[in-house]
């Protein structure tokens, strides 16, 4: 009696279990009672990454430099090309089809997490005792200068955008 289910790496067709094509190959013709499944290798710049019964291979992704993309992993007959972004840019989506410039953290904000090829800069407001006076994609909030350790006194209070200004202590005459 004909099978209703097939083993792993097989598929059911015409009441018969046929072997799937291995990764890197596409289906040309199904097996018959007398012949094996016929498979053909994918062409150059094409791939199939699973055991399959596809009649066409997928095209490799193109990491278009005009979109700020570059190749992270070259495509093969079994794997697609993996794109990432040029330095200073990050992917706009998980599929990494285009890139945008890393955001900078404005004065008063510091970098909590530096951007990568796939994630943007994460900024955080500088808490009391810290400041950032630049717009940067790398700079963290810096601690206010400690006037006391320099035997000086605070002449001007710090803010989230400016450091404290230290000055000499008033001498008793």
């Amino acid at each position: 009696e004909p099978p209703t289910a097939c083993r792993e790496k097989q598929y059911l067709i015409n009441s018969q279990c046929c072997s799937l094509c291995q990764p890197g190959q596409k289906l040309v013709s199904d097996c018959t009672e007398f012949t094996e499944t016929e498979c053909l290798p994918c062409g150059e710049s094409e791939f199939l990454d699973t055991w399959n019964r596809e009649t066409h291979c997928h095209q490799h992704k193109y990491c278009d430099p005009n979109l700020g993309l570059r190749v992270q992993q070259k495509g093969t007959s079994e794997t697609d090309t993996i794109c990432t972004c040029e330095e200073g840019w990050h992917c706009t989506s998980e599929a990494c089809e285009s890139c945008v410039l890393h955001r900078s953290c404005s004065p008063g904000f510091g970098v909590k997490q530096i951007a990568t090829g796939v994630s943007d800069t994460i900024c955080e407001p500088c808490p009391v005792g810290f400041f950032s006076n630049v717009s940067s994609a790398f700079e963290k909030c810096h601690p206010w200068t400690s006037c006391e350790t320099k035997d000086l006194v605070v002449q001007q209070a710090g803010t989230n955008k400016t450091d404290v200004v230290c000055g000499p202590q008033d001498r008793l005459r």
């Epitope: 290798p41 062409g43 710049s45 990454d49 190749v71 070259k74």
Partner: antibody, heavy 119, light 113 residues
Framework: EVQLVESGGGLVKPGGSLRLSCAAS????????MHWVRQAPGKGLEWVAY????????YYADTVKGRFTISRDNAKNSLYLQMNSLRAEDTALYYC????????????WGQGTLVTVSS | DIVMTQSPDSLAVSLGERVTMNCKSS????????????LTWHQQKPGQPPKLLIY???TRESGVPDRFSGSGSGTDFTLTISSLQAEDVAVYYC?????????FGGGTKVEIK
């Protein structure tokens, strides 16, 4: 028998242009990706550019980006490299090499054509 | 860009002796999808173009004598000639076939002692 024959090399002044050709025979040219690789006199190998079998994908080395253009004519079994704004450091033997869809490696190389950039 | 570093730059070995050369990449050449290391070796004899010797780290190209063998994974690779023959005098280049730009090592020159 697989054959790759480069031509078009020669002496050119800095800032000048040159077009290299690579004539392929002995295999189905349109089934293969193609590369240009160069070798400065007495030096090692430097990859220059790649074009996929169907012209869809093109990559360049940073050293030639914006100056060199790789192209192919599958009907003529030919690969090309248009070289503009040539510099002294582009002086090298230029090889074409094919890439198949199985190994994804350069499995055959031509004999090379010499490009000399000098005033 | 991936930097490929070969060592030694050159070596002189007696005929019939074993030859070992190394290649180090600045990042892994392991394809995460198919678990193959995309490290290629080319042989360039004097006055000739390069010739593909080994791909996927250890797979010999058709027609390459079995005295040539490749090994390694990730970032460290080795090419071995088990018994040096006169026709093996050449420069051997390792190549990153994992990503663009494709990059080559500086080469190891093999001579007869």
């Amino acid at each position: 028998e697989v054959q790759l024959v480069e031509s078009g090399g020669g002496l050119v002044k800095p800032g000048g242009s040159l077009r290299l050709s690579c004539a392929a025979s002995g295999f189905t040219f349109s089934d293969y990706g193609m590369h240009w690789v160069r070798q400065a006199p007495g030096k090692g190998l430097e990859w220059v550019a790649y074009i996929s079998s169907g012209n869809r994908i093109i990559y360049y080395a940073d050293t030639v980006k914006g100056r060199f253009t790789i192209s192919r004519d599958n009907a003529k079994n030919s690969l090309y490299l248009q070289m503009n704004s040539l510099r002294a450091e582009d002086t090298a033997l230029y090889y074409c090499a094919r890439q198949d869809g199985y190994r994804y490696a350069m499995d055959y190389w031509g004999q090379g054509t010499l490009v000399t950039v000098s005033s | 860009d991936i930097v490929m570093t070969q060592s030694p730059d050159s070596l002189a070995v007696s005929l019939g002796e074993r030859v070992t050369m190394n290649c180090k990449s600045s990042q892994s050449l392991l394809n995460s999808g198919n678990q193959k290391n995309y490290l290629t070796w080319h042989q360039q004899k004097p006055g000739q173009p390069p010739k593909l010797l080994i791909y996927w780290t250890s797979t010999r190209e058709s027609g390459v004598p079995d005295r040539f063998s490749g090994s390694g994974s990730g970032t460290d690779f080795t090419l071995t000639i088990s018994s040096l023959q006169a026709e093996d005098v050449a420069v051997y280049y390792c190549q990153n076939d994992y990503t663009y730009p494709l990059t080559f090592g500086g080469g190891t020159k093999v001579e007869i002692k």
